[in-house]
Every structure is written in structure tokens, then in C-alpha cells.
Interface confidence: medium
């Protein structure tokens, strides 16, 4: 019979013959012959292959380097790579998460608009009129100025974007 020019899914053509690919998690040891099946072997510890393949070597799992602020989010298997993420307080510098940088803190006069995640930095916003922040924080929002009126007090010192208003007793002397 005519030798095949194309093979079915999960097969590959070699020496005019269709051989089965190795399943995910296994590597190729030897191609099939007229008389034998494809020979595959499982990937070793800390190795993986994530597709049907004819690779003779498995890929090494990614190393989550703690010196770069990385930790393991999901341990690799023989069929999947290790997924790294950043330690708490840090976020990835790229989609591949090859290294991490420290979350930014919002300085006094600025509040947190959006708390950082493992992949995005803190978003700070200036405290608008009527609000203040006197801390350097990766978590704290701008706080509203104290309402002196609701305490039956008057403003003795105006607030700023970094300081609260200072309330004091009402002047009882009236003309």
C-alpha cells in the first residue's frame, strides 16, 4: 500500500509511517516501527511536557526565585509548569511574572484609590478638598475632615490634604 503522507491527530509521520505521539507528561524514547509502538517515558521530578509530543527531553519546571520576590502559586506537575506569583506586598513586573517589585505606598496628602494586587501596583490619588491623609500607606484611603458642626464645635484650624481640621468650642460671647 501507498505510504501515508499525513497522519491522524495525535500521530506523527516518520519513515513513511504514522507513529503515536507521547501523551502530556511523557517524552519520546523511541519511534514506532512496523512491529513496535512508540515508546514513551514519564517526565522526571521537576519536569513537564504539556502537549501531545515527540520531544526527547522534558522541560524543567520554572523556578520561583525568592530573591526576586517570587513564590509558588501552583506547583508544577508532569503535565503543567509551575506558576509563580509575588510575595504579599509585591507585584509582578511582567505578564510572565519573572520578577517582582514592591507595592508603592501613598504618601501623606494622597490616598489609595486601588489596592495593589499580585499583578498591579497601588494606585494613589490626591486627597480632594474636604479629605486628608497623614500616613504613608499602601492601604489607607483619604479620610474626610472631621465635621465640627455635628459636635457642636467650630473650626479653629482649617484642614489640608495632610491634616484634619482642628475643632474648638464655640465663642459664647455675642454682640
Amino acid at each position: 500500500p501507498e505510504p501515508p503522507t499525513a497522519c491522524r491527530e495525535k500521530q506523527y509521520l516518520i519513515n513513511s509511517q504514522c507513529c503515536s505521539l507521547c501523551q502530556p507528561g511523557q517524552k519520546l524514547v523511541s519511534d514506532c516501527t512496523e512491529f513496535t509502538e512508540t515508546e514513551c517515558l514519564p517526565c522526571g521530578e521537576s519536569e513537564f511536557l504539556d502537549t501531545w509530543n515527540r520531544e526527547t527531553h522534558c522541560h524543567q519546571h520554572k523556578y520561583c526565585d525568592p530573591n526576586l520576590g517570587l513564590r509558588v502559586q501552583q506547583k508544577g506537575t508532569s503535565e503543567t509548569d509551575t506558576i509563580c506569583t509575588c510575595e504579599e506586598g509585591w507585584h509582578c513586573t511582567s505578564e510572565a511574572c519573572e520578577s517582582c517589585v514592591l507595592h508603592r505606598s501613598c504618601s501623606p496628602g494622597f490616598g489609595v484609590k486601588q489596592i495593589a494586587t499580585g499583578v498591579s501596583d497601588t494606585i494613589c490619588e490626591p486627597c480632594p478638598v474636604g479629605f486628608f491623609s497623614n500616613v504613608s500607606s499602601a492601604f489607607e484611603k483619604c479620610h474626610p475632615w472631621t465635621s465640627c458642626e455635628t459636635k457642636d464645635l467650630v473650626v479653629q484650624q482649617a484642614g489640608t490634604n495632610k491634616t484634619d481640621v482642628v475643632c474648638g468650642p464655640q465663642d459664647r460671647l455675642r454682640a
Partner: nanobody, 118 residues
Framework: EVQLLESGGGLVQPGGSLRLSCAAS????????MRWVRQAPGKGLEWVST????????YYADSVKGRFTISRDNSKNTLYLQMNSLRAEDTAVYYC???????????WGQGTLVTVSS
């Protein structure tokens, strides 16, 4: 100069409790977020918990959630870690750290050793 002095560690049986303290000086304590990290024997640093400057926001590692409580007293410049239902795997040297550091966890005290063993 930033100084952090941890205390309150010791030997405790599994299921027991301890309260760690961290006395801070050399910086305006109430302005900064603070955190606890720990280092088990032969292991790397592990983040435990973070508290925001005013104490409104608290965050915990999954391994301690529901058992540990972080708090602070800004009038006393002191950070606390209440540790309940302690397990053998909580054995470590515990450090408090200012956030953000100039580098990675760069302001250290001498740490306080917590040993959980029967």
C-alpha cells in the same frame, strides 16, 4: 535610626497561645503600615500578617488566618501579634518589619523565637 524590638516568644504546647510585641523607635510609627514575617529553621522568610497605618486594614497569610490577630497601639509605638491554636509548623523566629522598607525587609530587630512542641 529605625529600631524594632520584638518580644513575647517562648516554648508553648500545640494548641497554646502567645502574644508577641514589637516596640518601634527611630521613626514616626503611626505613619507607616507594619508587618510580621517569620523564618522557620532552615527555611526562607515567610510573610505572616500586615496592618495598615491606622489599623483599619489587616491581612493574613492563609497558613495563619483565623488563628493569628495583628494589632497596633500607635500611642505606644507598639505592634502586636496574638497567636492562638499554635501548631508545630508555627515554630520560627518572628520579626516585625516596617512597610515599605528601603529594601526587602531591611529593618529588622533581633526577632523572637517561638517554639511549639509537646
Amino acid at each position: 535610626e529605625v529600631q524594632l524590638l520584638e518580644s513575647g516568644g517562648g516554648l508553648v504546647q500545640p494548641g497554646g497561645s502567645l502574644r508577641l510585641s514589637c516596640a518601634a523607635s527611630g521613626f514616626t510609627f503611626w505613619v507607616y503600615d507594619m508587618r510580621w514575617v517569620r523564618q522557620a529553621p532552615g527555611k526562607g522568610l515567610e510573610w505572616v500578617s500586615t496592618i495598615s497605618a491606622t489599623g483599619v486594614h489587616t491581612y493574613y497569610a492563609d497558613s495563619v488566618k483565623g488563628r493569628f490577630t495583628i494589632s497596633r497601639d500607635n500611642s505606644k509605638n507598639t505592634l502586636y501579634l496574638q497567636m492562638n491554636s499554635l501548631r508545630a509548623e508555627d515554630t520560627a523566629v518572628y520579626y516585625c518589619a516596617k512597610y515599605p522598607p528601603a529594601g526587602r525587609f531591611d529593618y529588622w530587630g533581633q526577632g523572637t523565637l517561638v517554639t511549639v512542641s509537646s
